[in-house]
Structure formats: C-alpha cells, structure tokens
Interface confidence: low
C-alpha cells in the first residue's frame, strides 16, 4: 500500500479581517493510524491552532466529522480572522505511539494572508499657530492594515498636494501595517476655512477611500492690521478716535486706549463681524473731552491678538490755543500720527 | 556653554544634493527653534530655514521648494537637505539656535531671534 | 524688504544709531560680522534683549517699523558689518538686511 500523503490544495489563501478562513487538508490513506494537528508555522515554536485528539479550539471548527472512521478530510475553518492569523498553516498527521504520537508527515503548508482595512486616517497639524506664508507640516496616520500595497494622497480643498512624505511600516513582513505620512503646507491669508484632507486607498475598500480632515482654522493665525481714523467732531469739544482692526484670526483680541501712555480703557473683541475669507473685523472708538488737555494728545491704540506681543497705531491730536480750520480725515501713518487742530 | 557643530559642507555638483547636520550641546535641545543661515561669496547673510516648535518650518525664499529641515531631538541634531544644488548655493553655512521655542509678533521670525551661531560649513558647488 | 543704511562711520567715543526698517508688528535682532564668512556674533534679539556675554554699550530698541542698534562709545573694534534681521512685512518670511558696514575713524 502508497504511504500516506498530507495534501493542502492552497499554498495560499487571501481572507478580509473578520472572515472565516477555510485551510484544506486532505490525507490519502487511513493508515497508519492517528490523530491530525494544525500548527501555525514551522519548527521548535510552532504554535497548535488545532489538535483533532485533545484540546479546546473555539475559534476552529472541522469541514468534515472527524469521528467517522473512513474520514480523511481534515480542513478546519478559522473565524473571525484578524491581522494577528496571518502566517503559513501546516497540516500534520501523527502516528499513535506511547507514551506520546510521533509525528507522521506534514503537508507542504498553506499560506493565510489576511486583508484588513485600514483604520480612519487621523490628521493632526503643528501644536502651535503659524501665521500665512509660512509653511507647517500635517501628519496622517492609519494603521492595521494588510496587505502592504497601499495608496496615500493629500489635498487641500480639493487641490492635490505633492509636497509630502510617506512611511509604510514596518519594512519587512508582518501581520499589519501602518503608514505614517507628512505633508508640507503654506498657509495663505485666506487658510481660514480651509481643510487639508488625506486620503487612504487600499483593496479593502473596494474603490471607497478613507479620509482625514484638519482644518486650518486650529492652526492659521492671521495678525490683524490697524488704522486709526479722527472723526468729525460731535461736540466743540470733543473728539471721536475709531481703530479699526482688521483681518484677524482667530477672535481673541484685547484693545487698550492709551492716552499720552496712561491706559484709558481696555475691552475685548465682542461683537466682531466676519469677512467673507473667515477672519474679523472689529471697531473701537473713543471720545476724547480735548477741552481737558491743556497739551498735545497722543492716543495709541493697543492690540494683543491671540496671546501674541501687542501690536499698536498712535494718532496725535494737537491742542491749539488759537482756532484753526479741522482738518480732513485720514488714516494714521504707519510711521507715526496725524496732527490735528482741535477747538 | 552652547556650541553647535556644523558638518556636510564640502564640493557638490550641480544638480545634486546635500545634506548638512548641526550638532548642538549646552542647552536643552528640544527646547529651542533652530535654523540655518548662509552666506555667499562678497554677500551678506540670508535666511534659509528655520524649525520651530510643533515641527512648523520655514525656508528662505531662494530654497523654497528645494530645502527640507528636519530635527532629532534624542540626538541634538537639525538637518538641512537640500536638492537641485545650483552654482549661487556656493557658501558657508552657519547652523543657528533661536532664544525660544515659538513665535512671537504673530509671526516665526527666525532671524530675529538668534542667540547662538556655528562656526560655518563651506558649500562649494561646481562641476 | 528690510532697509538699513550700507554704511556709517564714526569717531572714537561717539554714539552711533544704525537703522532698520521693516515690520512695524515684528521684532529684530541684531548681528556683528567682523570678516566674511566668520560666524556671526549676536548683539541683539528680540529687538532689545542683549546676550550677558554682550557690552551694555550695545542697545536695541524700536519705533514703529524702524529699529535701531545704539552703540555707544564707539572703539576702534567696533568695526564690522551689522546686520539686522525680521520679518518682511508683506511676506512674513524671515530675512536679514543687507549689513551696515561700520567704520571707526
């Protein structure tokens, strides 16, 4: 009579994580007699996925009933396969002996690989505000997967970017996979309602990528610009300073008036109203009493914007003793202030 | 005391790439802003890039595109890559450390905050 | 841009004021080069902090967009080229001026 082989049909087999995985094995003859085993991997550290004699296997359950004594189907099925399964599967007959079977004979393996979906592609930015023209990394991570082969783009809104670099670890086999990119981004002005976007591509998704969003609001900050402007005077004594402060993100602001280096009032951006790119405009006014001052005013408008250093615009309003025609409104020079003639 | 330890320089040829290291001890590394300056044969200093907290960097108008700055904190190392090296790269290359860690004025300007410099690394580029 | 003046001269014990003028929101420091391609020294950063290592006789301060490197008492080793560093003011890109070429009479 033949010797008795150990046949696996599939030296492999493809499985999506969750699955059950059919290993086939079938043997040619009955003799000699003994049980069957399944192990996972070859050698000293083989591990036993299934003993047909003894043991409890919750995971595995057989083809074929292996207590039919003509039975020389041995496949298993493996449930709820996870990325953890993947590995070369034997099938291996034993002879009865005593004290202990002897190994018989092996078949020649078969190879589970395991598709797992890649996790939700999470995007996280810089830990600090960066301000527009500069450039600032996002990274995207998603791990979990297998196969290796996977496809990893960036886009903001809707525009691809090609500035990046992309990690798919670890380099050698293994079960799972993760893959780790970063891409670089300029900010513009207009960043505020922007969203960077990375996209995951794998065969388990079946044409459905995966997507990571960030949105640059968290991470632009865009410095506002000041102007103080004198308006027309309200009373023959009085006069109305506004400081408009514009084009800024994100909303916290705090405006001091000083008055010839003296603090006069400190308030908070409120009532802000938006641009259309997403940053603010505000607008804080004070009524100067002139007829108080017997010297040159200087006002100062004094912004501290989203914890940064203040930045600030003067304006002189000279006091004259003897009546001049008001002069016309126009914004305060970068450099230094308008003179006014105030009676 | 701080010191920062260039090294990379040397001849390149055009169209090529280079890779500088600085090597910075006496403070705490991780800490701080770093960054790299240049300057050509008969010119005056410029810009090339900055890392800064949170790993935003910037890079000087003349490299942008080109340069990729990177940081090791383990190590107390900022990297310069640079690729596409063209003949006005020629010049020495001085690593720099900022006096802080973020940004200031709502901006990351890294040329107004340095308190520590390299002694230089020569770039030559040249076929 | 940043715009500092190409050069200044002074006599021994003078005052001398070099100027900068760029970013009115942004800060500048301040750098002594002594000969090209030799590591500059940093005088002043963050517009007006000093090094410990640095005289008191250097000073920065700034008004509006225009900084300005104070060095008082001028001696014969002050000679160098100064260089002032921001940010431009439209870009927001970091860069330096152009270097003051400082000649002690």
């Known amino acids: 009579e033949e010797e008795l082989q150990v046949i696996q049909p599939d030296k492999s087999v493809l499985v999506a994580a969750g699955e059950t995985a059919t290993l086939r094995c079938t043997a040619t003859s009955l003799i000699p007699v003994g049980p069957i085993q399944w192990f996972r991997g070859a050698g000293p550290g083989r591990e036993l996925i299934y003993n047909q004699k003894e043991g409890h296997f919750p995971r595995v359950t057989t083809v074929s009933d292996l207590t039919k004594r003509n039975n020389m189907d041995f496949s298993i099925r493996i449930g709820n396969i996870t990325p953890a399964d993947a590995g070369t599967y034997y099938c291996v007959k034993f002879r009865k002996g005593s004290p202990d079977d002897v190994e018989f004979k092996s078949g020649a393996g078969t190879e589970l690989s395991v598709r797992a979906k890649p996790s939700a592609p999470v995007v996280s930015g810089p830990a600090a505000r960066a301000t527009p023209q500069h450039t600032v990394s996002f990274t995207c991570e998603s791990h979990g997967f297998s196969p290796r082969d996977i496809t990893l783009k960036w886009f903001k809104n809707g525009n691809e970017l090609s500035d990046f670099q992309t990690n798919v670890d670890p380099v050698g086999e293994s079960v799972s996979y993760s893959i780790h990119s970063t891409a670089k981004v300029v900010l513009t002005r207009e960043d505020v309602h922007s969203q960077v976007i990375c996209e995951v591509a794998h065969v388990t998704l079946q044409g459905d990528p995966l997507r990571g969003t960030a949105n640059l609001s968290e991470t632009i900050r865009v410095p506002p610009t000041l102007e103080v402007t004198q308006q027309p005077v309200r009373a023959e004594n009085q006069v109305n300073v506004t400081c408009q402060v514009r084009k800024f993100y994100p909303q916290r602001l705090q405006l001091t008036w000083l008055e010839n280096g003296n603090v006069s009032r400190t308030e908070t951006a409120s009532t802000v109203t938006e641009n259309k790119d997403g940053t603010y405009n505000w607008m804080s006014w004070l009524l100067v009493n002139v007829s108080a001052h017997r010297d040159d005013v200087k006002l100062t408008c004094q912004v501290e914007h989203d914890g940064q250093p203040a930045v600030s615009k003067s304006h002189d309003l000279k006091v004259s003793a003897h009546p001049k025609e008001q002069g016309s409104n126009t914004a305060a020079e970068n450099t230094g202030s308008n003179e006014r003639n105030i009676y | 005391a701080v010191t920062l330890d260039e090294s990379g320089g040397g001849l390149q040829t055009p169209g090529g790439a280079l890779s500088l290291v600085c090597k910075a001890s006496?403070?705490?590394?991780?800490?701080?802003?770093m960054g790299w300056v240049r300057q050509a044969p008969g010119k005056g200093l410029e810009f090339v890039a900055a890392?800064?907290?949170?790993?935003?960097?910037e890079y000087g108008a003349a490299v942008q595109g080109r340069a990729t700055i990177s940081r090791d904190n383990g190590q107390s190392t900022v990297r310069l890559q640079l690729n596409n090296l063209r003949a006005e790269d020629t010049g020495i290359y001085f690593c720099?450390?900022?006096?802080?860690?973020?940004?200031?004025?709502?901006?990351?300007?890294?040329?107004?905050?340095?308190?520590?410099w390299g002694h230089g690394t020569e770039v030559i580029v040249s076929s | 841009a940043v715009t500092q003046p190409a050069s200044v001269s002074a006599n021994p014990g003078e005052t001398v004021k070099i100027t900068c003028s760029g970013s009115?929101?942004?800060?500048y420091g301040w750098y002594q080069q002594k000969s090209p391609g030799s590591a500059p020294v940093t005088l002043i950063?963050?517009?007006?902090k000093r090094p410990s290592n640095i005289p008191s006789r250097f000073s920065g301060s700034k008004s509006g967009s225009t900084a300005t490197l104070t060095i008082t008492g001028v001696q014969a080793d002050d000679e160098a080229v100064y260089y002032c560093?921001?940010?431009?003011?439209?870009?927001?890109?970091?860069?330096f001026g152009a270097g003051t070429t400082l000649t002690v009479l």
């Open positions: 720099a450390k900022d006096a802080g860690s973020g940004c200031y004025s709502g901006v990351c300007a890294g040329t107004s905050s340095i308190d520590a």
């Open positions: 006496g403070f705490t590394f991780s800490s701080f802003n």
């Open positions: 890392i800064y907290s949170g790993n935003s960097a």
């Open positions: 009115s929101s942004g800060s």
């Open positions: 950063y963050e517009t007006n």
């Open positions: 560093g921001s940010e431009d003011s439209s870009t927001y890109l970091s860069i």
